[in-house]
């Protein structure tokens, strides 16, 4: 009103929602008697009496503040509990006598919003969108006053940018009087944004000062066309037959295009499409040398039907062919010599080794094995191993059996067997020679014969132990075109004295047989437990 003294600025009181506001009447004694005060709330320039103080006693007026007001500080302060956003207004105290004066208090109310809730576009964003696309939404609930939102990309605040970045925000008032802020970030994204981290920040004020809350960081699915296609082979490095090999087509586009893998046919000079699995991966298992060749990948954009071709990739599946040994089935006389030759093909340089089958002893490094002054013991298996030293595990082997001509050779000359009378005994006799011998027994029983290998035979005999048999023992005779040889099995009855804890028996010394064609076995001794070979 013109001519009226300008009102002083109201005192500012700041409180958080839910707390108690202390409204101190700042009238001096000269301005009025604090034991006689009226309190008003001012809303839209309308005063409403809310509290009276008379003789230091307070009395609430009926209405919205009735239950929440009380006097403190000997009547100088009005306490307003459970502050709400609707309480943000001017309160004034008016003293009575000597003259009416008033003191104004501006109540400011604050509430921190909840953590901002960010939601990313679940469908993703293509880089070629005509206008900025919705990247993410941010919701800050129940704040007061309205918080401010700032969007960040890779830690940098985003500013409005025509046709590039647009931030659209709106707020709603809840029934509580609190604000919910909603914001949506729209942007034109580029391929490099596929790894970009976006988040939103709410800035708000409390009585204690300025604060902020950040959402979690999110990445947005970004769709961009394929520009480059390439092949990857697993495992990396030298491949060999038998490996599981995966040929994978890769592209730098998102989503990945539709792939097809083809292999060049050297004879027709045409590419033939290979059958891939559901993921577009060509699996070669087991890999074979025929899988070697030139592979390439074609990527199709099913929207545009434009295709891209990868650089061709040469695949080499290393191999070692079947190993051939000559002669394949060598036969030699004792004292003679033998040359074994090993051959194989490979995609890499080969190393050859000759090993004795029975002992795995390396006899020769190289494809040729020469054996001189052959003894009967030289008969048996020789293994040629062709390997590629640069590729562990890539090797092939071939076994050859050397046969030395000779009369039968007995596994033992004599053996003592502990028996009980009337038991059925299982006896065995083994002989080797070339040609392969046959075995006969000097007693009646059930005999069965089995080949151990081409030069060796094992015969078993089931026989009943009789007093006569105990007296005579049992003989087995092995014979071939070059002679015969015999083994004797002595049968001895088990008795308590023979079954001492450490008792064991030793066969007697071998002696030569009378056959004109045989050579006596070497002398041998054999330790046996004093028990029957078999119980009937």
């Amino acid at each position: 009103v013109p001519g009226e003294a300008e009102q002083p600025a109201p005192e500012l009181v700041e409180v958080e929602v839910g707390s108690t506001a202390l409204l101190k009447c700042g009238l001096s004694q000269s301005q009025g008697n604090l034991s006689h005060v009226d309190w008003f709330s001012v809303h839209k320039e309308k005063r409403t009496l809310i509290f009276r103080v008379r003789q230091g006693q307070g009395q609430s007026e009926p209405g919205e503040y009735e239950q929440r007001l009380s006097l403190q500080d000997r009547g100088a302060t009005l306490a307003l509990t459970q502050v709400t956003p609707q309480d943000e207004r001017i309160f004034l105290c008016q003293g009575k006598r000597p003259r009416s004066q008033e003191y104004r208090i501006q109540l400011r109310v604050y509430k921190a919003p909840e953590e901002p809730n960010i939601q990313v576009n679940p469908l993703g964003i293509p880089v070629n969108s005509k206008e900025p696309e919705e990247v993410a939404t941010c919701v800050g609930r129940n704040g007061y006053p309205i918080p401010q939102v700032i969007w960040y990309k890779n830690g940098r605040p985003l500013k409005e940018e025509k046709n590039r970045v647009h931030i659209q925000s709106s707020q709603t008032v809840e029934s509580s009087g609190l604000y919910t802020l909603q914001s949506i970030l729209k942007a034109q994204l580029v391929k490099e944004d596929k790894d970009a981290q976006f988040y939103c920040e709410l800035n708000y004020r409390l009585p204690s000062g300025n604060h902020m809350k950040e959402s979690r960081e999110v990445t947005v699915p970004v769709f961009y066309p394929t520009e480059k296609v390439w092949l990857e082979v697993e495992p990396v490095g030298m491949l060999k037959e038998g490996d599981r090999v995966e040929i994978r087509c890769l592209a730098d586009g998102n989503p990945p295009p539709h792939f097809s893998i083809s292999k060049g046919n050297p004879s027709t000079r045409e590419a033939e499409e290979e059958t891939t699995n559901d993921n577009g991966v060509l699996v070669l298992e087991p890999a074979r040398k025929e899988h070697s060749g030139r592979y390439e990948c074609q990527a199709w954009n099913l929207d545009t039907m434009i295709s891209l071709l990868s650089e061709p990739q040469e695949l080499l599946v290393n191999y070692v062919s079947d190993v051939r040994v000559s002669p394949a089935a060598p036969e030699r006389q004792e004292g003679s010599s033998l040359t074994l030759t090993c051959e194989a093909e490979s995609s890499q340089d080969l190393e050859f080794q000759w090993l004795r089958e029975e002992t795995d002893q390396v006899l020769e490094r190289g494809p040729v094995l020469q054996l001189h002054d052959l003894k009967r013991e030289a008969g048996g298996g020789y293994r040629c191993v062709a390997s590629v030293p640069s590729i562990p595990g890539l090797n092939r082997t071939q076994l050859v059996k050397l046969a030395i001509f000779g009369p039968p050779w007995m596994a033992f000359k004599e053996r003592k067997v502990w028996v009980k009378e009337n038991m059925v005994l299982n006896l065995s006799c083994e002989a080797s020679g070339h040609p392969r011998p046959t075995i006969s027994w000097n007693v009646n029983g059930t005999a069965s014969e089995g080949d151990q290998d081409p030069q060796r035979v094992l015969s078993t005999l089931n026989v009943l132990v009789t007093p006569e048999l105990l007296e005579t023992g049992v003989e087995c005779t092995a014979s071939n075109d070059l002679g015969k040889n015999t083994s004797i099995l002595f049968l001895e009855l088990v008795n308590l004295t023979t079954l001492t804890p450490d008792s064991n028996t030793t066969t007697g010394l071998s002696t030569s047989t009378a056959s004109p064609h045989t050579r006596a076995n070497s002398t041998s001794t054999e330790r046996k437990l004093p028990e029957p070979e078999s119980r009937g």
């Epitope: 939601q119 990313v120 576009n121 679940p122 969108s129 206008e131 919705e134 919701v139 909603q182």
Partner: antibody, heavy 118, light 106 residues
Framework: QVTLKESGPVLVKPTETLTLTCTVS????????VSWVRQPPGKALEWIAA???????YYNSAFKSRLTISRDTSKSQVVLTMTNMDPVDTATYYC????????????WGQGTLVTVSS | DIQMTQSPSSLSASVGDRVTITCKAS??????LAWYQQKPGKAPKVLIF???SLQTGVPSRFSGSGSGTDFTLTISSLQPEDFATYYC????????FGQGTKLEIK
């Protein structure tokens, strides 16, 4: 107020193409995206396709090669075409509005039942 | 694709009961989840969004909770109009719905 209404044939023969139209009112297609969602009889809901407020189109990869979604902002219409229809495509087809500040559907059409049969 | 598994698939309850329906995501979806109610022959209606925010106009007896992979829709005191089928839906990566929970009168 916001409304969405689906229209199109109720019966389609196998191998034929289905064309559905969603006519909207109470909002602009340039401020809210629209999706198509279907529901076979007695079964769950299945999202099919969407068009954003900016006009970007999205498809469920299970039917991608058969679908086209487009819009005519002047007519406030969104059109879905689905080729090579099969009896398993028999369903109620709904169009739904995407909430402007979220990614859920706040308003739906009443749906149209499409039967695929010879 | 993210799978959403609801349990139970059906549920019988009485008016006044407290009812809980759960939804499990096959991977972390943070709170990108909505709940819908569908009555026979009608379109779905959104109840809850962002896992726990009540849609305007939806009675406060409906509430949502959970984050990550496990989510719950609770009806604190069933009313006759609440008997319907309820669906959860994730919007973290694409859109997928649960198979539904049919809430019937006991």
């Amino acid at each position: 107020q916001v409304t969405l209404k689906e229209s199109g044939p109720v019966l389609v023969k196998p191998t034929e193409t289905l064309t559905l139209t969603c006519t909207v009112s109470g909002f602009s297609l340039t401020s809210n995206g629209v999706s198509w969602v279907r529901q076979p009889p007695g079964k769950a809901l299945e999202w099919i396709a969407a068009i954003s407020s900016g006009g970007t189109t999205y498809y469920n990869s299970a039917f991608k090669s058969r679908l086209t979604i487009s819009r005519d902002t002047s007519k406030s219409q969104v059109v879905l075409t689905m080729t090579n229809m099969d009896p398993v495509d028999t369903a109620t087809y709904y169009c739904a509005r995407r909430y402007g500040y979220g990614w859920y559907f706040d308003f739906w059409g009443q749906g149209t039942l499409v039967t695929v049969s010879s | 694709d993210i799978q959403m598994t609801q349990s139970p698939s059906s549920l019988s309850a009485s008016v006044g009961d407290r009812v809980t329906i759960t939804c499990k995501a096959s991977q972390n979806i943070y709170n990108s989840l909505a709940w819908y109610q569908q009555k026979p022959g009608k379109a779905p209606k959104v109840l809850i969004f962002n896992a726990n925010s009540l849609q305007t106009g939806v009675p406060s007896r409906f509430s949502g909770s959970g984050s990550g992979t496990d989510f719950t829709l609770t009806i604190s005191s069933l009313q006759p109009e609440d008997f319907a089928t309820y669906y959860c839906q994730q919007f973290y990566s694409g859109y997928t719905f649960g198979q539904g929970t049919k809430l019937e009168i006991k």
